[in-house]
Interface confidence: low
């Protein structure tokens, strides 16, 4: 199941996902935004909207193309809300064959940080709390690991 | 209200030293990355160097080496640590908070001077 | 690195008239990465314009700023008496530099 991170949780600072992002089994750090959830069978499946790439795997997703997170059922710890933006960091994507082509989906498994984004920038705690996301964002953006 | 106040400029001698300090108030200073900018007399605004809000420092060319950037957000104090002046580095040094939306200047103190001559 | 070149250098308007400053990049800029600021006479810059086109709080709603790319404008629909000073416009770039423009001086014709 994949680690959710307290919301709006100003103790977690640019360099600690910085160092989560680069770490070697992370293969992918990207900002999403969820546009819809289904059930099938023992998974659920989030497609999502790819906003912004900070590092990126051997599945190459393009920005603002439709990707998909899958987890089992039973990982309560790590509901996605639909509308909602989040940070998510992982291993590398299964890789599933589709028609003539590949696809991609992205595993909420134990290694996966998943941090939610808030869109709304009125509130001084989302303030303070967007400002360290955006400083890991430039930083990784810029610097890269 | 936010407030910036520069101090520590004063006349060195080239190949001297100087510590300029910004206090900052009115805002959660360890939340903002933080820079200082100088302008030469009756020139442009030159960017000097940036600190992020966890301490990572980005310098300009022109002063990289020589020029250390710092903070400390126990006091809500930005420093600029100035060596190996030259007359070049002759300025009013501002130091500026930068947006929360990372790429300018919000607010800005009223500057300090320093003047590197013989 | 990119470098700002703002044209006019200087420029004279009437009171209530309309100005306008040029602001071209070497290379493209993000929007999201350019603004301008005044520096009235004695004091320190101000911000007036981020993400090319966004007034910062307090800025008079005459100011304005456009462009993309590598072109950038900032309008004064009516020239007041406090616009007074220079003008810089400033962008961010991705090797972490900023950089500035080399201002431009508007008075009071």
């Known amino acids: 199941c994949g680690q959710m991170q307290e919301e709006l949780d100003l103790t977690i600072s640019a360099e600690t996902r910085k160092q989560t992002a680069c770490k070697p089994e992370i293969a992918y750090a990207y900002k999403v935004s969820i546009t819809s959830i289904t059930v099938e069978n023992v998974f659920v499946k989030y497609k999502a909207t790819l906003l912004d790439i900070y590092k990126t795997g051997e599945a190459v997703a393009e920005k603002d193309s439709e990707i998909t997170f899958i987890k089992k059922v039973t990982c309560t710890n790590a509901e996605l809300v639909k509308g909602r933006q989040y940070l998510i960091m992982g291993k590398e994507a299964l890789q599933i064959k589709y028609n003539f082509s590949f696809r991609y989906i992205y595993p909420l498994d134990s290694l996966t940080w998943i941090e939610y984004w808030p869109r709304d920038t009125t509130c001084s705690s989302c303030q303070a709390f967007l400002a360290n996301l955006d400083e890991f964002a430039e930083d990784i953006f810029l610097n890269g690991c | 209200e936010v407030q910036l106040v520069e101090s520590g400029g004063g006349l060195v001698q080239p190949g001297g030293s100087l510590i300029l300090s910004c206090a900052a108030s009115?805002?959660?200073?360890?939340?903002?990355?933080m820079t200082w900018v100088r302008q030469a007399p009756g020139k442009g605004l030159e960017w000097v160097c940036a600190i992020s809000g966890s301490g990572s420092t980005y310098y300009a060319d022109s002063v990289k080496g020589r020029f250390t950037c710092s903070r400390d957000n126990s006091k809500n104090t930005l420093y600029l640590q100035m060596n190996s002046l030259r007359a070049e580095d002759t300025a009013v040094y501002y130091c500026?908070?930068?947006?929360?939306?990372?790429?300018?200047?919000?607010?800005w103190g009223a500057g300090t001077t320093v003047t590197v001559s013989s | 690195d990119v470098v700002l070149t703002q044209s006019p250098l200087s420029l004279a308007v009437l009171l209530g008239q309309p100005a306008s400053i040029s602001c071209r990049a070497s290379q493209s800029v993000s929007s999201s990465y350019l603004a301008w600021y005044q520096q009235r006479p004695g004091q320190s810059p101000r911000l007036l314009i981020y993400?090319?086109?966004s007034r910062a709080t307090g800025v008079p709603d005459r100011f304005s700023g456009s462009g993309s790319g590598t072109d950038f404008t900032l309008k004064i629909s009516r020239v007041e008496a406090e616009d007074v000073g220079v003008y810089f416009c400033?962008?961010?770039?991705?090797?972490?530099?900023?950089?500035f423009g080399g201002g431009t001086k508007l008075e009071i014709k």
């Open positions: 400033q962008q961010y770039g991705r090797s972490l530099e900023y950089t």
């Open positions: 993400g090319a086109s």
């Open positions: 500026a908070r930068r947006g929360l939306r990372y790429n300018y200047f919000d607010y």
């Open positions: 009115g805002f959660t200073f360890s939340s903002y990355a």
